[in-house]
């Protein structure tokens, strides 16, 4: 018995070959002997049953001369899964058609971090097929009648080529995934005290009409609880602020990409935030983490202090030195001090390995004079 695979809604070609490689009489039947179509010697395709009953069934007249009499079934339905009989040259060929349906749950447009389940359904009792989907960038996911893709990333978007294999017979189908998310899962901004701060949240997808709502929650390092800094709506890509905290006085752009500015980087704002975006007609939310590290350099009485506030890594080093001189203090901690600093230009650097994350300069006028 020959096996043919077909996807619901598409077409399948069931083979039937003559040994003499020339035109001959043939008949395609269902397993209950009802005639589907055939050729009875005049080179004319004769259909069985009523026209509407068999309008999905056809053959390739152009192939008859070569001794090939395939049965073409268009717009495949699940109930087409059965055995078909081709009668020719006093013999019967049995062809089994397995029609499968592919369902994507919850769909092919998902949010970053969500999972996709691809299910093959069929009303024929076939043994487990092998299903394999390959992304154009090389990622491969495989399963049987159920294939799962978890924790989807923006880079999983685009076309996937999927193959269903059963008894060495293959059928392929494509799926286009759209994974909506931010370009970066997390970002960190380093600023000197008093500088303006920019937070940008570019989306990694473009849609014609983007509608939803969002909020930025902020957990300051020095605060015991988080605070909602801003809430906003998004309609057809236009941002409108609903509510904004009075401290800090944030400004938000009305065009995408989502963009926020803080008038000043102050120690009390150092910390981390979480921007959430809920999109219309989508369950779940998009998230982007943003971190603010603030550097403060000050001279008070007889001591020069450099301090960083906010989420720094333990590998980061804070260095305080006179410009063009060797480091005076360099430690893997968040505060460094020099007592009785010499007059001149001092520099504080926050670095990780050989990479300087930020630096701040201060002019020390004379010992014991306040200067910030």
């Amino acid at each position: 018995k020959t096996l043919v695979l077909g996807k619901e809604g598409e077409s399948a070609e069931l083979p039937c070959e003559s040994s003499q490689k020339k035109i001959t009489v043939f008949t395609w039947k269902f397993s209950d002997q009802r005639k589907i179509l055939g050729q009875h010697g005049k080179g004319v395709l004769i259909r069985g049953g009523s026209p509407s009953q068999f309008d999905r069934f056809d053959s390739k007249k152009g192939a008859w001369e070569k001794g090939s009499f395939p049965l073409i079934i268009n717009k495949l339905k699940m109930e087409d899964s059965q055995t078909y009989i081709c009668e020719l040259e006093n013999r019967k060929e049995e062809v089994e058609l397995w029609v499968f349906k592919v369902t994507f749950s919850p769909g092919t447009s998902l949010l970053q971090g969500q999972s996709l389940t691809l299910t093959l359904d069929s009303n024929s009792k076939v043994s487990n097929p092998l299903t394999e989907c390959k992304h154009k960038k090389g990622k491969v996911v495989s399963g049987s009648k159920v294939l799962s893709m978890s924790n989807l990333r923006v880079q999983d978007s685009d076309f996937w080529n999927c193959t269903v294999t059963l008894d060495q017979k293959k059928n392929w189908f494509g799926m286009t995934l759209s994974v909506l998310g931010f370009q970066k899962a997390s970002s960190i901004v380093y600023k000197k005290e008093g500088e303006q701060v920019e937070f940008s949240f570019p989306l990694a997808f473009t849609v014609e009409k983007l509608t939803g709502s969002g909020e930025l929650w902020w957990q300051a390092e020095r605060a015991s609880s988080s605070k909602s800094w801003i809430t906003f709506d998004l309609k057809n890509k236009e941002v409108s602020v609903k509510r904004v905290t009075q401290d800090p006085k944030l400004q938000m752009g009305k065009k995408l990409p989502l963009h926020l500015t803080l008038p000043q980087a102050l120690p009390q704002y150092a910390g981390s935030g979480n921007l959430t975006l809920a999109l219309e007609a989508k369950t779940g939310k998009l998230h982007q983490e943003v971190n603010l590290v603030v550097m403060k350099v000050a001279q008070l009485n007889n001591t020069l202090t450099c301090e960083v506030m906010g989420p720094t890594s333990p590998k980061m080093r804070l260095t305080l030195k006179q410009e063009n001189q060797e480091a005076r203090v360099s430690e893997e901690q968040k505060v460094v001090q020099v007592v009785a600093p010499e007059t001149g230009l001092w520099q504080c650097l926050l670095s990780e390995g050989d990479k300087v994350k930020m630096d701040s300069r201060i002019q020390v006028l004379s010992r014991g004079v306040n200067q910030t």
């Epitope: 303006q196 309609k235 236009e238 409108s240 602020v241 938000m252 065009k255 500015t261 008038p263």
Partner: antibody, heavy 119, light 107 residues
Framework: EVQLLESGGGLVQPGGSLRLSCAAS????????MSWVRQAPGKGLEWVSG????????YYADSVKGRFIISRDISKNTLYLEMNSLRAEDTAVYYC????????????WGQGTLVTVSS | AIQMTQSPSSLSASVGDRVTITCRAS??????LGWYQQKPGKAPKLLIY???SLQSGVPSRFSGSGSGTDFTLTISSLQPEDFATYYC?????????FGQGTKLEIK
């Protein structure tokens, strides 16, 4: 061809009211953001009020908030500015302006209508 | 509201001169800034949008640059018809705000 035609200006006493209209044609009025901009005699330009094309949200300069109301009638392709509790400092030429499709500036302006607030 | 500081407030120049007008925003506004030209008794005219894009029909001697907080309008070679008042406008968010204007006069 895009056209914006303001009307409704005139002389009004302090504390009085006036409604300006801006008849628009030549573009999809319902989806375009629109604004009112004014210019006091011999002074610079001041943005007064705006209405979003996508969601109909309304926005105002602090100087007119609570006194002016911007609105639109999509069936008539007309933008309005309802001005109440008028003050002498509201005396200006009022322009209606159309924003570019992607909110990048005002690409078309009306000819302006003069509002004079005086007793 | 975001403040826009434009300078100079007035400027005298001759035909053929290269002229630069600057605008500074009190907040970072990306490139959400436009430049307008206004002649006496006339409505303003958009010259530059999105900080550096030339509006259709505007001569190429006009150019804009900058992003964040500092912006510049440059007229590479002044023509007699360029003597007018120029304004910058931030359209980063509402309420929109104009600069105070720069009056460009013939020297």
């Amino acid at each position: 061809e895009v056209q914006l035609l303001e009307s409704g200006g005139g002389l009004v006493q302090p504390g009085g009211s006036l409604r300006l209209s801006c008849a628009a044609s030549g573009f999809t009025f319902s989806t375009n953001a629109m604004s009112w901009v004014r210019q006091a005699p011999g002074k610079g330009l001041e943005w007064v009020s705006g209405i979003s094309g996508s969601n109909g949200n309304t926005y105002y300069a602090d100087s007119v908030k609570g006194r002016f109301i911007i609105s639109r009638d999509i069936s008539k392709n007309t933008l309005y500015l309802e001005m109440n509790s008028l003050r002498a400092e509201d005396t200006a030429v009022y322009y209606c302006a159309k924003e570019r499709d992607n909110w990048n500036g005002f690409d078309y302006w009306g000819q302006g209508t003069l509002v004079t607030v005086s007793s | 509201a975001i403040q826009m500081t434009q300078s100079p407030s007035s400027l005298s120049a001759s035909v053929g001169d290269r002229v630069t007008i600057t605008c500074r925003a009190s907040h970072v506004i990306r490139n959400d800034l436009g430049w307008y030209q206004q002649k006496p008794g006339k409505a303003p005219k958009l010259l530059i949008y999105a900080a550096s894009s030339l509006q259709s029909g505007v001569p190429s001697r006009f150019s804009g640059s900058g992003s964040g907080t500092d912006f510049t309008l440059t007229i590479s070679s002044l023509q007699p018809e360029d003597f007018a008042t120029y304004y910058c406008l931030q359209d980063y968010n509402y309420p929109y705000t104009f600069g105070q204007g720069t009056k460009l006069e013939i020297k």
